[in-house]
């Protein structure tokens, strides 16, 4: 990266510049490189108890650039900063810090969370979701006819997907019972299959967390000649299961 | 709490002195290289003059050079501009500021007007 | 030396309007370029450095792109507060250099 580093190796006087080695334009026995030739960065070197002058195609980690007129020069960077625009701007802060306006922090401040590609400190994101779409039609197995119960779905789409620390997102699909309206499925009917997936039934004990209450959507949904007493519901729900035996062999 | 309070400023004839002053507090003065940016009225910003962090090396816009001199006492956290052979075109309002690349503390300003 | 070049001069815009200032340098800076705003009688106020980066205080509806010879400042929403005039500043090399700066008016 910073290949063009000169130092001396033979003995000789401050400011003599013949022997310099690599990028020096100037050097001393005791300090290494005092100038630098042309686009090249002088930066101090510290070896021991003493500073010893290079001369860098660019500065190195820890240290920002100045491009005076007569000399391009290496300055160090705070101590928990590796890359900085200035003594008081860090851009990229060494391990363990995280970065925020331009400062190196062991914790990112209240409300912020740590982005630990970037390492740095970023607003947190709440999830965000859109409105929900209409319900799908109503369907039993796939079919909109035959006078039963059936399910409806309608799904929303997340907008923003939440960071680490954001809002987690809430359920993005729907599912309640209708019925189905009332209307004789013509035969080798297929029925028009609702715009959703079919959902997986949950088993019993199962949650059903995304499916509502549906008895006060259903009550609002219901017309007066659909209500029934319990004898013919009864009645019905034997000849639905022998109904869907029939349907299910259909492909 | 960062503060540069520039002074010395006021009405000069043509051809005459002025010598400006700027009291830096808040920060390590003798870290920072300083300047003098200039403005005048109704105009942009121009770069006068910079002086490096420990005095060693100034430099000046072209316009200035051999009549401004630019000085600091980092004793004394202040930072100096003399100001001599004023044209018309010297004429603005003066700020002293931090310079590390970017300005970064800047002075309220001090108004110079140079005028017969 | 390195020029600066902004655009436009001056802007007439409401509160709430997205506002675009461009800057122009005649050679490549990387991204050595810095923002400042000023209010009028007050000195000028950093507000980014390294051409995208906020300054601490700088409201995040303010920011700043660009790389190489092209670059810009956005305002996304504009507040009355930001009416002011704004610079932008090379800070690659000396000598230091401005554009010559984008006065934003109330429409």
């Known amino acids: 990266q910073n290949a063009s580093r000169g130092r001396r190796q033979r003995r000789m006087h401050p400011n003599v510049s013949q022997g310099c080695q690599g990028g020096c334009a100037t050097c001393s026995d005791y300090n290494g490189c005092l100038s630098c030739k042309p686009r090249l960065f002088f930066a101090l070197e510290r070896i021991g108890m003493k500073q010893i002058g290079v001369c860098l195609s660019s500065c190195p980690s820890g240290y920002y650039g100045t491009r005076y007129p007569d000399i391009n020069k290496c300055t160090k960077c705070k101590a928990d900063c590796d890359t900085c625009f200035n003594k008081n701007f860090c851009t990229k802060c060494k391990s363990g810090f995280y970065l925020h306006l331009g400062k190196c922090l062991d914790n990112c401040p209240e409300g912020l969370e740590a982005n630990n590609h970037t390492m740095e400190c970023v607003s947190i994101v709440h999830c965000e979701v859109s409105e929900w779409n209409p319900w799908s039609p109503c369907t039993k197995k796939g079919k909109t006819c035959g006078f039963k119960r059936g399910t409806e779905t309608r799904v929303r789409e997340i907008i923003q997907h939440p960071s680490a620390k954001g809002n987690l997102c809430p359920p993005t699909n729907e599912t309640r019972k209708c019925t189905v309206q009332r209307k004789k499925c013509q035969k080798g009917e297929r029925g028009k299959k609702g715009r959703e997936r079919k959902r997986k039934k949950p088993n019993k004990g199962e949650s059903k967390e995304a499916i509502p209450d549906s008895k006060s959507l259903e009550s609002s949904k219901e017309i007066p000649e659909q209500r029934e007493n319990k004898q013919q519901q009864k009645k019905r729900k034997v000849q639905d299961k022998q109904k869907s035996v029939s349907v299910s062999t259909v492909h | 709490e960062v503060q540069l309070v520039e002074s010395g400023g006021g009405v000069v004839q043509p051809g005459r002195s002025l010598r400006l002053s700027c009291a830096a507090s808040?920060?390590?003065?003798?870290?920072?290289?300083m300047a003098w940016v200039r403005q005048a009225p109704g105009k942009g910003l121009e770069w006068v003059a910079t002086?490096?962090?420990?005095?060693?090396?100034?430099y000046y816009r072209d316009s200035v050079k051999g009549r401004f001199t630019l000085s600091r006492d980092n004793s004394k956290n202040t930072l100096y501009l003399q100001m001599n052979s004023l044209r018309a075109e010297d004429t603005a309002v003066y700020y002293c500021a931090a310079h590390d690349r970017s300005f970064d503390y800047w002075g309220q300003g001090t108004m110079v007007t140079v005028s017969s | 030396d390195i020029q600066m070049t902004q655009s436009p001069s001056s802007l007439s815009a409401s509160v709430g309007d997205r506002v675009t200032i461009t800057c122009l340098a005649s050679?490549?800076?990387?991204?050595?370029l810095v923002w400042y705003q000023q209010k009028p009688g007050k000195a000028p106020k950093l507000l980014i450095y390294?051409?995208?980066r906020l300054q601490d205080g700088v409201p995040s509806r303010f920011s700043g792109s660009g790389s190489g010879t092209d670059f810009t400042l956005t305002i996304s929403s504009l507040q009355p507060e930001d009416f002011a005039t704004y610079f932008c500043q090379q800070s690659y090399k000396y000598l230091p250099t401005f554009g010559q700066g984008t006065k934003l008016e109330i429409k």
């Open positions: 050679e490549d800076i990387s991204n050595d």
């Open positions: 390294a051409a995208s």
């Open positions: 808040g920060f390590t003065f003798s870290d920072y290289d």
């Open positions: 002086i490096i962090y420990d005095g060693s090396r100034t």
